[in-house]
Interface confidence: low
């Protein structure tokens, strides 16, 4: 609330704006009849330096000239870029209690002269747009700097616009607001940018261009596609463009793809035929435009057109597999399974499958359609049967895929040898085998089939399978493989009319089982004890059980227990032991072992054999 500069004045020499590295003299003078009231000779003028409103220095020692009690001159050096505030204050030395009184102040700006603007670039967006130019201003000047953009052209065309840069805004682009029309296509235009501030001025080199150099067409709009005769592979792409466009670039890709198909089209006039599209596929289309074949700039890409191509009839071969089960002496159940076609083969939404089971002599033919990927029928056990399946969408059906129904494990001579299953990582298993030793007919292919060994898996879940060429002896199975689950894996060797198989159990990862088998009964028969148990619940097995252990020890004994190890068989749930003393009470329990280790013990049962020792 002080009336600044009522007491005196502050002046700067050579000027309040100075180049970096220069010194300045600041003079502070009291107005007549101002100063300390009692003793004018005791007037002391001091100069304070502020940066960003913070006092950084008292320049008492920089005084270069002094008229006692009237005026003082101070020299300031090493000023940093930007603005510095200096405030002159009056200190009446006879009164220590009163603070110095502000007299007046001055701002000194330190900066540099502007560099010549460089890299001028001009653009007109669309035939009806206006010319806008941008440039590189060079080093920051730290001063308010004015920029003038001047354009000159044919027929005495001149135009200019101005803007300025300071510590709040940057000026490196100006829109001239004029439109260059196509009838000036061959004409040359010149622009230059001039920069000026309190320390100097500079000018860019002239920048010359033509209409074609700077006009960027607007991106095409109103894009649509028409599929010829509802074809899934051929379509006409149509769009709207500015009138002067002579060249278009089209790009298109399926939505899940990572690489574009690119096409250049000359004089397309908003229309182009595409012939290599994939049926029933979501595509994205974009178009860009150019006004001249050799010169000029491409427009931005248009907005995307996203659409799905129509369906076409399915192609490809279904992968079929089957299971046979004898029902009684003259009937068998055939379950056919097949894998869905991949999208490039299905070429549409599969509506149903046509399934045919035929006795080779053509006596009997069973036909049906199903929307599922499996089909089960009961047929006579006599005769040679063949199955075929085709897939149908709204446009037609695929060629039927045939498979001969043979006894899959009927020929021991065709059974693969040395089948092994090795866990590779959490979600796959490597199955290897050796070819059949004495096959009397050539192996046409191997089928590796697997399913989880859980209750009801044969009826509830279809098998998974892989077809392997006859010269391969390994398969990495990963479909539906989960850790801590035991799978039954079968390797089938198929000839034209016979099959042989070998089976193994395997898991991709294992842990020791959560619990041991539950002993349900102990019975004594012919001086042997039969231990009966229930298997460990499926979720608690945590991999393939290799074997069970039966432990026993005399009740109250501290000795290590005896044990008997039994190779695991799913069908077995009892086992005899014969090394127990009669009329001695034993405690018995069981554990289960996977490749990762042994389970905790199951329930304990006490039993006292009555027969005589073996």
């Amino acid at each position: 609330n002080i009336d600044v500069c009522k007491l005196g004045t502050v002046t700067v020499q050579p000027a309040p704006v100075i180049p970096l590295g220069s010194a300045a003299n600041i003079s502070c003078s009291l107005n007549p009849k101002q100063g300390c009231s009692h003793y004018p000779s005791s007037n002391e003028l001091i100069l304070l330096k502020f940066v960003n409103d913070v006092l950084v220095e008292n320049l008492h020692g920089k005084k270069v000239h002094d008229h006692t009690g009237h005026s003082s001159t101070f020299q300031v050096t090493n000023l940093s870029l930007g603005m510095t505030l200096f405030v002159c204050k009056l200190n009446c030395s006879n009164s220590q209690k009163k603070p110095p009184v502000p007299v007046c102040g001055v701002e000194i700006s330190v900066g540099v002269a502007p560099e010549p603007p460089q890299n001028i670039s001009c653009v007109q967006e669309g035939e009806n747009g206006t010319v806008a130019c941008s440039w590189n201003s060079g080093k920051v000047t730290y001063l308010k700097t004015n920029y003038t953009l001047q354009l000159s052209g044919p027929n005495n065309l001149t135009c200019q616009k101005q803007c300025f840069s300071d510590n709040r805004q940057n000026c490196n682009r100006l829109d001239l607001g004029i439109n260059l029309s196509p009838d000036l296509a061959e004409s040359r235009f010149i622009v230059r940018v001039t920069a000026i501030n309190d320390l100097g001025n500079s000018s860019s080199l002239p920048h010359t261009f033509t209409f074609l150099d700077i006009v960027i067409p607007l991106p095409p709009w109103d894009i649509r596609i028409n599929f010829l005769n509802a074809s899934g592979s051929r379509g006409t792409l149509q769009w709207e463009d500015e009138g002067q466009v002579v060249l278009n670039q089209l790009r298109y890709q399926p939505l899940n793809s990572t690489s574009w198909n690119m096409v250049n089209a000359t004089n397309a006039k908003g229309k182009y035929d595409l012939r290599d599209l994939r049926p029933f596929t979501e595509y994205e289309f974009q178009i860009s435009s150019k006004l001249h074949l050799s010169g000029g700039s491409w427009s931005n890409w248009s907005e995307s057109l996203r659409t799905r191509t129509p369906e076409e009839e399915p192609v490809g071969i279904l992968d079929i597999w089957y299971m046979k089960q004898d029902i009684d002496y003259d009937r068998q159940q055939i379950s056919l399974f097949w894998k869905s076609l991949n999208p490039s083969e299905a070429r549409g939404k599969i509506l149903h499958y046509q399934v045919t089971l035929q006795e080779v002599t053509k006596k009997t033919t069973l036909q049906n359609t199903t929307r599922h990927t499996s089909w089960t029928r009961v047929i006579p056990r006599t005769g040679a049967w063949t199955a075929s399946v085709s897939a149908a969408n709204s446009k037609g059906a695929s060629a039927p895929t045939h498979i001969n129904i043979v006894d899959l494990c009927g020929t021991g001579l065709l059974a693969p040898h040395q089948v092994s299953a090795k866990s590779e990582n959490m979600d796959n298993i490597l199955v290897t085998w050796q070819p059949p030793k004495k096959a009397d007919s050539a192996v046409r292919e191997y089928i590796v089939e697997w399913r989880a060994l859980q209750p009801g898996s044969i009826t509830k879940f279809p098998p998974h399978w892989l077809r392997i060429p006859p010269d391969n002896m390994s398969a990495l199975i990963s479909e539906n493989i989960k850790p801590y689950i035991c799978y039954e894996i079968r390797v089938h060797a198929l000839s034209e009319s016979q099959g042989g198989c070998s089976s193994i159990r395997g898991d991709s990862k294992h842990k020791a089982p959560v619990s041991g088998p539950h002993i349900t009964a102990i019975t004594e028969k012919k001086e042997r004890l039969f231990i009966s148990w229930t298997h460990i619940p499926f979720p608690e097995q945590r991999g393939c059980i290799l074997h069970y252990r039966i432990y026993w020890k005399e009740r109250d004994s501290t000795a290590q227990p005896e044990l008997c190890e039994i190779q695991y068989r799913r069908s077995q749930n009892s086992h005899p032991i014969s090394s127990l003393q009669p009329r001695v009470t034993y405690v018995l329990w069981m554990t289960a072992v996977t490749a990762a280790g042994e389970s905790p013990q199951g329930n304990e049962r006490e039993f006292c054999p009555q027969g005589k020792a073996n």
């Epitope: 020791a512 290799l546 227990p561 005896e562 190890e565 190779q567 090394s579 072992v593 280790g597 042994e598």
Partner: nanobody, 123 residues
Framework: QVQLQESGGGLVQTGGSLRLSCAAS?????MAWFRQAPGKEREFAAV???????YYANSVKDRFTISRDNAKETVYLQMNNLKPEDTAVYYC????????????????????WGQGTQVTVSS
């Protein structure tokens, strides 16, 4: 054929510790340590069956710990509070076939043997 390679033996003072390792070149089910002191017969020290069932000779119980890393097919014998009478050549033994009714104490139950590693406990 499974090869066994022992390591970790050496000279240690009474009351000290050592850790022996035995790496198998294939999958095994039971892995055991036996030891043979100078002028004596080879004797059972410890066995691990499956992943976690362990048995020890009375002479090493509460001082030795047997463990295994199934992923590496390696068995370890951590020997603490060693005594001069623990001085011996320590042998690793393994069985790939699961034995029927033994408990892993008997040498005859093992198909595969390592070359041995010397452990010397000085007083």
């Amino acid at each position: 054929q499974v090869q066994l390679q022992e390591s970790g033996g050496g000279l240690v003072q009474t009351g000290g510790s050592l850790r022996l390792s035995c790496a198998a070149s294939g999958r095994t089910y039971a892995m055991a340590w036996f030891r043979q002191a100078p002028g004596k017969e080879r004797e059972f020290a410890a066995v691990i069956i499956g992943g976690d069932r362990t048995y020890y000779a009375n002479s090493v119980k509460d001082r030795f710990t047997i463990s295994r890393d199934n992923a590496k097919e390696t068995v370890y014998l951590q020997m603490n509070n060693l005594k001069p009478e623990d001085t011996a050549v320590y042998y690793c033994a393994a069985n790939r076939r699961l034995y029927n009714s033994g408990r892993g104490y008997s040498q005859s139950e093992y198909e595969y043997w390592g070359q041995g590693t010397q452990v010397t406990v000085s007083s």
